[in-house]
């Protein structure tokens, strides 16, 4: 999906209002220095591309993020403010259904969410630079 035509201001508002709080809740008990951020993003479409991939693509070490509250809200936000996004997400929905139901938060999932927080913060910063 090409995120170029999204309403970035609206996505930022949704992130600051709800998604960020859910991410921080997920990370509760860990310090921001506990994990080393190894990925970043260049501009707004790039940030959303990587956020989408990291949130919804299961990895061998962390298969369950797609079922988390922040992931559901991320999906709803992208569907709302990115034209045509919903139609491209049928496969992603299947992946969410296949994701493990276990609510155990592994260290690797915490690391992945730490990376997500970094990508979202970069998204906000690139938005501020453009204004």
């Amino acid at each position: 999906y090409d995120f170029t035509n999204c309403d970035f201001q609206k996505i930022e508002a949704d992130y600051l209002r709800t998604i960020s709080k859910d991410l921080i809740t997920y990370m509760s008990g860990t310090k921001s220095t506990d994990f080393n951020n190894t990925v970043s993003c260049s501009n707004r479409p790039h940030c959303l591309t990587e956020i989408q991939s990291l949130t919804f693509n299961p990895t061998p070490r962390c298969a369950s993020l797609a079922k988390e509250m922040f992931a559901r809200k991320t999906k709803a936000t992208l569907a709302l403010w990115c034209p045509g996004y919903s139609e491209t997400q049928i496969n992603a929905t299947q992946a969410m259904k296949k994701a493990r139901k276990s609510k155990v938060t592994t260290n690797k999932c915490l690391e992945q969410v730490s990376q997500l927080l970094g990508l979202w913060r970069r998204f906000i910063r690139t938005l501020l630079k453009k204004q």
């Epitope: 080393n36 990925v39 970043s40 260049s42 501009n43 990587e50 991939s53 990895t59 990376q115 630079k129």
Partner: antibody, heavy 117, light 108 residues
Framework: QVQLQESGPGLVKPSETLSLTCTVS?????????WSWIRQPPGKGLEWIGY???????SYNPSLKSRVTISRDTSKNQFSLKLSSVTAADTAVYYC??????????WGQGTLVTVSS | EIVLTQSPATLSLSPGERATLSCRAS??????LAWYQQKPGQAPRLLIY???SRATGIPARFSGSGSGTDFTLTISSLEPEDFAVYYC??????????FGQGTKVEIK
């Protein structure tokens, strides 16, 4: 300390597919970062080809996108480049590199690929 | 596509002298710029990222400055091992990351 090593044929015929592999040691490619390909024609500058991130997202240089495929084999800690329909203009030293999806902090030593019949 | 123009193409200096290399972008890249050093037969090495942050293990004599369209790499006092080709790279314009054409720093 991460080390990267390119391997593959040094000579490819025009119109064929160039295939290279990068073997990574000292770091798991499924643990973090992105894993990129960059090339440098003899005596010229650098050109970014694309990357695959540790979680599987892929991004390509638009000028090469129609001909490029980057994939990975996490069990071997390798990632690969395929470039189809090559011409003499694709003759270059090909580098694999580790990236944070922005810039490139560790590089392989490079492998020269010549396109010639 | 953002074009990066490096100047001069060649810089002839003696060890101990100060080297000032320029990189100009065709449009603003904010501070999304990196510098690399490449010696003959070797891979490039990251020196500077985010326009002014030194990469791990890079000596303090290397410094970067600038923002927007004009950037400078300064080598305060050239060591014999610093004679090489230097490239700038912008990462503001995903998915079109581009490099400059390079500046060669040679011994006078």
């Amino acid at each position: 300390q991460v080390q990267l090593q390119e391997s593959g044929p040094g000579l490819v015929k025009p119109s064929e597919t160039l295939s290279l592999t990068c073997t990574v040691s000292g770091y798991s490619i499924s643990s973090g970062y992105g894993w990129s390909w960059i090339r440098q024609p003899p005596g010229k500058g650098l050109e970014w080809i694309g990357y695959i991130s540790y979680y599987g997202s892929i991004s390509y240089n638009p000028s090469l996108k129609s001909r490029v495929t980057i994939s990975r084999d996490t069990s071997k800690n390798q990632f690969s480049l395929k470039l189809s329909s090559v011409t003499a203009a694709d003759t270059a030293v090909y580098y694999c590199a580790r990236t944070n999806l922005l810039y490139f902090d560790s590089w392989g030593q490079g492998t020269l690929v010549t396109v010639s019949s | 596509e953002i074009v990066l123009t490096q100047s001069p193409a060649t810089l002839s200096l003696s060890p101990g002298e100060r080297a000032t290399l320029s990189c100009r972008a065709s449009q603003s890249v904010s501070n999304n710029l990196a510098w690399y050093q490449q010696k003959p037969g070797q891979a490039p090495r990251l020196l500077i990222y985010d326009a002014s942050s030194r990469a791990t293990g890079i000596p303090a004599r290397f410094s970067g400055s600038g923002s927007g369209t004009d950037f400078t790499l300064t080598i305060s006092s050239l060591e014999p091992e610093d004679f090489a080709v230097y490239y700038c790279q912008q990462y503001s314009d995903w998915p079109q990351y581009t490099f400059g054409q390079g500046t060669k720093v040679e011994i006078k």
